[in-house]
C-alpha cells in the first residue's frame, strides 16, 4: 500500500502490469484482465444503501499516484490499496472500510437518533 | 547491447513435440517480457503469448492453448516455448522477442520443419 | 481478434521517392491508460522483423528521420519520404492494445 504522504512521482514501467479487474474493467481488458502502465488496485466503498463494494482493476501512471494515496474523504467511506510488485497482485489486497466515525451519523444524509 | 539468441533449425516428426529455447543478454532478463510470434513461408506473423519471466505469469493467444506452454529459467536468462503433438502446420518460423509496452528486439528466429 | 488491414500489400517506388503505407483496425487502438500502441516494422528478405516506429510516430533508436509515422484510433499511416535500396523488404504494422496482439499482413516496398 502506497504511504498518505508519499509525494514522489511515479516511476514509468518498462512493462505492462496485468491485473485482476471486477465491476471497473475497461473496453480491451480480456478475461478479467486489464493492463496497465502503472499500478493494480483493490478498493472497498459504500453503496447508496451503505453496504460495502469491491471493485478492482487498474489505474494508468498518470494521477495514479494521487490516486492510490488513501485520501479520506469527506461523508464517504472508501479505501483504496495499489500494488505493482508483480502481475494480477490485486488479488492479495484486501483493503478495510474505515470505521464510522460519530459526526458521519450526523452530517449524513440519514439522521439517527 | 540486447540480444536474443535462439538456435538454429529443428526438424521433427509428426506428433512429437520441440522445446525452443531463446537466451537473453544485454538487459535485466526480469524487466521485460518475452513474446513469441510464429511466422509460416509467405505468410503473416502470428502472436503465440507471451510470459513475463519476474513472476512466470502467462498470456496466451487462444488459437495455441495446448498447443504451445512458455517458461523461463531466470538463472539463466532462458525462455522456453514447448510445442505438442506437432502437424505439418506447425511447420514455421518461431520468433521470441523482447516486450515492454511493444515489441523492441527479436530473435533471429528458429525454423520449425514437422516432416516424417 | 483486432483485424489489422494493411494498404498497398506491394508498393513499386523509385529509389529517391516518398513512400506511404496505411494501416487500419477493425477497433481503436486507444488503451484505457490513453496510449495508442501501434507499431510499425520492417523486414528484411531471411531477417528478422526490426522495430521503425512504436506507439503512432515515436521513432525508435537509430531509425533514420526519413521514416515519419502517423494516426489515431483506427487509421495510421507509415511514411519514407526518401527511399532508399536498404528500406526495401515488408512493413507490418501491429497493435499492442487488445490481447491477442495482432499483426498486419505486410506491405512489401519494392523497386519500381
Known amino acids: 500500500k502506497k504511504e498518505d504522504g508519499e509525494s514522489t512521482a511515479p516511476t514509468p514501467r518498462p512493462k505492462v502490469l496485468r491485473c485482476k479487474c471486477h465491476h471497473h474493467c475497461p473496453e480491451d481488458s480480456v478475461n478479467n484482465i486489464c493492463s496497465t502502465d502503472g499500478y493494480c488496485f483493490t478498493m472497498i466503498e459504500e453503496d447508496d444503501s451503505g453496504l460495502p463494494v469491491v471493485t478492482s482493476g487498474c489505474l494508468g501512471l498518470e494521477g495514479s499516484d494521487f490516486q492510490c494515496r488513501d485520501t479520506p474523504i469527506p461523508h464517504q467511506r472508501r479505501s483504496i490499496e495499489c500494488c505493482t510488485e508483480r502481475n494480477e497482485c490485486n488479488k492479495d489486497l484486501h483493503p478495510t472500510l474505515p470505521p464510522l466515525k460519530n459526526r458521519d451519523f450526523v452530517d449524513g444524509p440519514i439522521h439517527h437518533r | 547491447q540486447v540480444q536474443l539468441q535462439q538456435p538454429g533449425p529443428e526438424f521433427v516428426k509428426p506428433g512429437a513435440s520441440v522445446k525452443l529455447s531463446c537466451k537473453a543478454s544485454?538487459?535485466?532478463?526480469?524487466?521485460?517480457?518475452v513474446q513469441w510470434v510464429k511466422q509460416r513461408p509467405g505468410q503473416g506473423l502470428e502472436w503465440i503469448g507471451e510470459i513475463d519471466p519476474s513472476d512466470n505469469y502467462t498470456l496466451y493467444n487462444q488459437n495455441f492453448k495446448g498447443k504451445a506452454t512458455l517458461t523461463v529459467d531466470t538463472s539463466s536468462s532462458t525462455a522456453y516455448m514447448q510445442l505438442s503433438s506437432l502437424t505439418s502446420e506447425d511447420s514455421a518460423v518461431y520468433y521470441c522477442?523482447?516486450?515492454?509496452?511493444?515489441?523492441?528486439?527479436w530473435g533471429q528466429g528458429t525454423t520449425l520443419t514437422v516432416s516424417s | 481478434d483486432v483485424v489489422m488491414t494493411q494498404t498497398p500489400l506491394s508498393l513499386p517506388v523509385s529509389l529517391g521517392e516518398q513512400a506511404s503505407i496505411s494501416c487500419r483496425s477493425s477497433?481503436?487502438?486507444?488503451?484505457?491508460?490513453?496510449?495508442?500502441?501501434l507499431h510499425w516494422y520492417l523486414q528484411k528478405p531471411g531477417q528478422s522483423p526490426k522495430l521503425l516506429i512504436y506507439?503512432?510516430?515515436n521513432r525508435f533508436s537509430g531509425v533514420p528521420d526519413r521514416f515519419s509515422g502517423s494516426g489515431s484510433g483506427t487509421d495510421f499511416t507509415l511514411k519514407i519520404s526518401r527511399v532508399e535500396a536498404e528500406d526495401l523488404g515488408v512493413y507490418f504494422c501491429s497493435q499492442s492494445t487488445h490481447v491477442p496482439f495482432t499483426f498486419g499482413s505486410g506491405t512489401k516496398l519494392e523497386i519500381k
Open positions: 544485454g538487459y535485466t532478463f526480469t524487466s521485460y517480457w
Open positions: 522477442a523482447r516486450f515492454g509496452f511493444y515489441v523492441d528486439y
Open positions: 477497433q481503436s487502438l486507444v488503451h484505457s491508460t490513453g496510449n495508442t500502441y
Open positions: 506507439k503512432v510516430s
